[in-house]
């Protein structure tokens, strides 16, 4: 048993050109949450199938509002961490859905509107217990960036939280065959709960409630001795029954290596050394080819035909490992130049200027309107290495292409009647309100109810909005 | 949640000045539309000046050309001016929002201004 954490870091615009527009407006705004679905192996399967990992709905973020003419900035996030649980053993290969939703917050009938804004798939090689890996996957116009790892809960330890711990019995060394549990040092591996009988001297198992026996031993429980032909060198107190010469509880007796590994003892337990496509803490892990894909991130897989014969991955630029799951840092060198910030994309490094900048490595300086046109007659504002477009009254968006209705919104409060104008919108105040969106009441213990304004103010009156 | 307090209320004699504070937290003022409402003993409780989103300003008849209210994004803050005071301005003056996103509404605990030679 374990929990899979995903930290979203940031949700975006990618770099590059045909930034998307924000999700969010002053007339409409809205927040982020974000949904998990983990699939075990490498499946393929649509995003529709079952989640048999699990899956987990982030918090709501932040409500968000755009800034008119402010360049769609990373969203902001929900806190904490997206969990899953996994009640079993943590499969290793795992693929994984991570959807970016978007819930409204105008004044829908019936509560809040959601909508999927992004989806981002993978699949991945993961051993519980490791630390946090990154990650950056698009979406379109969008760019995720997050973090996830996978964990055993207690007593459950190991790349599949398959083995358990308990507390050391002596204190210098754990039992034969068993080895500390790092990084909890003072506590020992346990050994599995088998079968029920199962021969704690003459078998063993690797799953729970089985019972595997060691050579020279038969039976359900491992308790019927094969013949005395069978028994090993002499390492261990004669046995009543057949005369034979058990052997004690050495890491390598009976051989955990499945497969074909041989086994090999060290100081602390034992290693399996596996033949051609398998691997695996006891070669477990059956026969890899290049048909099942084993190679991320764009990885060549070459070889591997048949299951006795091993693959290659011959990995992009960017990553490395057996089969390129690990990322190369090549950011660390700091490439982009006058602040830009350096996204590794494996196949390829790309800069994310700052306003004001371009070029591969964001190495020259530009003047901010230089070829930039606002339309509708707009007008372009310099300032701070960035650029920004001064629309007429009427138009809107980044370069004033979008003819807004002021009044789509509701923008009157209070009851107030929107009436778009070719100055903006004016809002006719009910009764009993004020303001250029009719947002104060002028006696608020009973605003509706008023037969009056106060000398001098009509609240009937449209007030204009500039 | 927003949170509103109001300072700067006292005791000030006829023609005197006084300036109101009102710190906002849970919110930007830059998204809200705010005002100060103020409340006479033995009376209601009424609208004195406003300041929407979009910075536009209203103001009631009895006290345009004396107060002015005014809005500091950086300190998150909304203030208002009295100049020329007068014994009838003498009320528990209170700071208000309306935060555009939910449209709900919140109110500060008032502070206290006494007009008074």
């Known amino acids: 048993a374990g929990v899979f954490e995903l930290q979203i870091h940031s949700f975006g615009p990618g770099p590059g050109p045909g930034a998307p527009r924000s999700p969010c407006s002053a007339r409409l705004p809205c927040r982020l949450f974000f949904r998990v679905c983990l699939k075990p192996g490498l499946s393929e399967e649509a995003a529709e199938s079952p989640c048999a990992l699990g899956a987990a709905l982030s918090a709501r973020g932040p409500v968000y509002t755009e800034q008119p003419g402010a360049p769609a900035p990373d969203l902001p996030l929900p806190d904490g961490l997206l969990q899953v649980p996994f009640r079993d053993a943590w499969p290793g290969t795992f693929s994984f859905i991570i959807e970016t939703w978007r819930e409204e917050l105008g004044d829908q009938i019936g509560g809040p509107a959601w909508s999927l804004l992004a989806r981002v798939a993978g699949r991945r090689r993961l051993a519980a217990g490791g630390p946090w890996a990154r990650d950056i996957q698009r979406a379109g116009a969008w760019e995720l960036r997050f973090s996830y790892r996978a964990r055993c809960e207690p007593p459950a330890v190991g790349t599949a939280c398959t083995r358990l711990c308990r507390p050391r019995s002596a204190p210098s060394r754990c039992g034969p065959g068993l080895r500390p549990c790092a990084p909890l040092e003072d506590e020992c591996e346990a050994p599995l709960v088998c079968r029920a009988g199962c021969s704690p001297e003459h078998g063993f198992c690797e799953q729970p409630g089985e019972c595997r026996c060691l050579e020279g031993w038969t039976g359900p429980l491992c308790t019927v001795p094969v013949s005395t032909s069978s028994c090993l060198s002499p390492r261990g107190p004669s046995s009543a029954t057949t005369g034979c010469l058990v052997p004690g509880p050495g890491p390598c007796d009976g051989n955990p290596c499945a497969n074909g590994g041989s086994c090999s003892e060290t100081p602390r337990s034992f290693e399996c050394t596996c033949p051609r496509g398998f691997y695996g803490l006891r070669c477990e892990v059956s026969g890899v080819t290049c048909a099942d894909g084993p190679c991320f991130n764009g990885g060549l897989c070459v070889g591997g035909a048949d299951p006795d014969s091993a693959y290659i991955c011959h990995c992009p630029p960017g990553f490395q490992g057996s089969n390129c799951e690990k990322r190369v840092d090549r950011c660390s060198l700091q490439p982009c130049r006058n602040g830009g910030l350096c996204l590794d994309l494996g196949h390829a490094l790309r800069c994310r200027c700052r306003a004001g900048f371009a070029g591969p490595r964001c190495e020259h300086d530009l003047d901010d309107c230089a070829g930039r046109a606002c339309a509708n007659g707009g007008t372009c504002v310099e300032g701070g290495g960035a650029h920004r477009c001064s629309c007429a009254l009427g138009f809107g968006g980044r370069d004033c292409r979008e003819r807004a209705d002021p009044c789509a919104a509701r923008p009157c409060a209070h009851g107030g009647r929107c009436y778009a104008h070719f100055s903006g919108l004016v809002c006719a105040c009910a009764p009993g309100y004020m303001g250029a969106r009719c947002e104060f009441p002028v006696h608020p213990d009973g605003a509706s109810a008023l037969p009056a304004a106060p000398p001098g103010l009509r609240p009937g009156d449209p007030q204009r909005y500039l | 949640e927003v949170q509103l307090v109001e300072s700067g209320g006292g005791l000030v004699q006829p023609g005197g000045s006084l300036t109101l504070s009102c710190a906002a937290s849970g919110s930007s003022v830059s998204f809200l539309s705010m005002a100060w409402y103020r409340q006479a003993p033995g009376k209601k409780r009424e609208l004195v000046a406003g300041i929407s989103a979009d910075g536009s300003t209203a103001y009631i008849d009895s006290v345009k050309g004396r107060f002015t209210i005014s809005r500091d994004n950086a300190k998150n803050s909304v203030y208002l001016q009295m100049n020329s005071l007068r014994a009838e301005d003498t009320a528990v003056y209170y700071c208000?929002?309306?935060?555009?996103?939910?449209?709900?509404?919140?109110w500060g605990q008032g502070t206290l201004v006494t007009v008074s030679s």
């Open positions: 208000y929002a309306y935060r555009w996103t939910t449209r709900r509404t919140y």
